[in-house]
């Protein structure tokens, strides 16, 4: 988790002076409570934006946005700590709204937005604000929470974004596999504009079941520029075992920018279709 | 122009099934979540299923939960929902909607964040 850039962060608006800090997500409020402490924040919305860093970098970003309620305790609002809490690692990353003026009640409703907080393709994250300060202990809560989780690198938006590019999503290697005679699948692929070599992972199943009866590696070497977007064709010899019959194949490119961490593209053949009723039983059995 | 139309309510007997759909017109349907909503007569509105942009995360409403199927079709740009063993509690105004981000709300109250929603299809559970 990181946020977008270091430029200015800005959280000022008409009426009121605000400035962005680094927060070590402990406001001081949790260890001195207040008496008076604002309300929750109201219409909490969290949104997939994408933005481009001063170099030119494409990223996907937690669009946050909020507003207040309008009740009096917004005379004790004195700022905000925007959460946001990546869920398979634990990692959580804060930055806190400090109000440098009172808010006043004014014709329009109070809005806030925040942009800078880059997010990682097919992760989930939690996002709260809270308000500040914090309740005291057993006060009412002052934060909303939401839950979103991001497209993977599959989804046209986030194909051409930086992280999702760096990892080979625009490679498209149109897999086909083609069962042969004598126990051989024949697999074709096509080759990215790289001189990196490639790995075909097969991996067999029986028909109904998940557990591999088969499992074999296929080195590629990496092609010559010639062969850049030509379809490299490979032919796979099976086990001979009768019902391991469902194949994956899997390719594993290692290109420069992502190493042994590249996006995997795979197709699976299914086991033929099985007859729907059995072979009749001859009424006589021949002798010969 | 961007719309949802939901078709395949009706009335039907407690314990038996109905599978509503929803076509999708006007936008990108394979880029984003989409989610089906219903609303109880005199109630407000319910979150009941959402599913995300490939079908690789789907959500569930702890009532519907073990009952009720949510899918999608980017082909043809449909939502699905199989309702089994129909309750008279389910008896509502059933609604798909489409999520404004391209992310997949999976927590908290995400209805807030829905921008297009269907007329809706009356589901009616009685014996």
């Known amino acids: 988790l990181r946020l977008l850039d270091h430029r200015a962060l800005v959280c000022s608006q008409p009426g009121l002076n605000c400035t962005v800090k680094n927060s070590t997500c402990l406001d001081d409020s949790w260890i001195h409570p207040r008496n008076l402490t604002p309300s929750s924040p109201k219409d909490l919305q969290i949104q997939l934006h994408f933005a481009h860093t001063q170099q030119g970098d494409l990223f996907p970003v937690a669009h946050i946005e909020w507003t207040l309620q309008t009740d009096a305790s917004i005379l004790y609002l004195e700022g905000a700590e925007l959460s946001v809490l990546q869920l398979n690692t634990n990692e959580r990353l804060c930055v806190r709204f400090e109000f440098l003026s009172k808010l006043r009640h004014h014709h329009r409703r109070w809005r806030f937005t925040f942009s800078h907080f880059v997010v990682d393709p097919d992760q989930e994250y939690e996002v709260t604000v809270h308000h500040l300060p914090k309740p005291i202990p057993d006060g009412d809560p002052n934060h909303q929470s939401k839950n979103f989780l991001v497209p993977d690198c599959e989804h046209a938006r986030m194909k051409v974004t930086t992280p999702c590019m760096s990892s080979g999503s625009l490679w498209d290697p149109n897999i086909t596999v083609e069962t042969l005679e004598a126990h051989q699948l024949r697999v074709s692929f096509t080759l990215w504009n790289e001189s990196t070599h490639y790995q075909i992972l097969l991996t067999s199943f029986p028909h109904m079941e998940n557990h591999s009866c088969f499992e074999h590696m296929h080195h590629i070497p990496a092609p010559r520029p010639e062969e850049f977007h030509q379809r490299s064709n490979v032919t796979l010899t099976l086990r001979n075992l009768k019902g391991c019959c469902r194949h994956q194949v899997q390719i594993q490119p290692f290109f420069s920018s992502c190493l042994n961490d590249c996006l995997r593209h795979s197709a699976t053949v299914s086991c033929p279709e099985m007859p729907d009723t059995p072979e009749p039983i001859p009424d006589y059995m021949p002798l010969w | 122009q961007v719309q949802l139309v939901e078709s395949g309510g009706g009335l039907v007997q407690p314990g038996r099934s109905l599978r509503l759909s929803c076509a999708a017109s006007?936008?990108?349907?394979?880029?984003?979540?989409m989610h089906w909503v219903r609303q109880a007569p005199g109630k407000g509105l319910e979150w009941v299923s959402g599913?995300?942009?490939?079908?690789?995360?789907?959500g569930y409403a702890d009532s519907v939960k073990g009952r009720f199927t949510i899918s999608r079709d980017n082909a043809k740009n449909s939502l699905y929902l199989q309702m089994n063993s129909l309750r008279a509690e389910d008896t509502a105004l059933y609604y798909c909607?489409?999520?404004?981000?391209?992310?997949?709300?999976?927590?908290?109250?995400?209805?807030?964040?829905?921008?297009?929603w269907g007329q809706g299809t009356m589901v009616t559970v009685s014996s």
């Open positions: 909607a489409k999520e404004k981000s391209l992310g997949y709300c999976s927590g908290g109250s995400c209805s807030d964040g829905f921008d297009i």
């Open positions: 006007g936008f990108s349907f394979d880029e984003y979540a």
């Open positions: 599913i995300s942009w490939n079908s690789g995360r789907k």
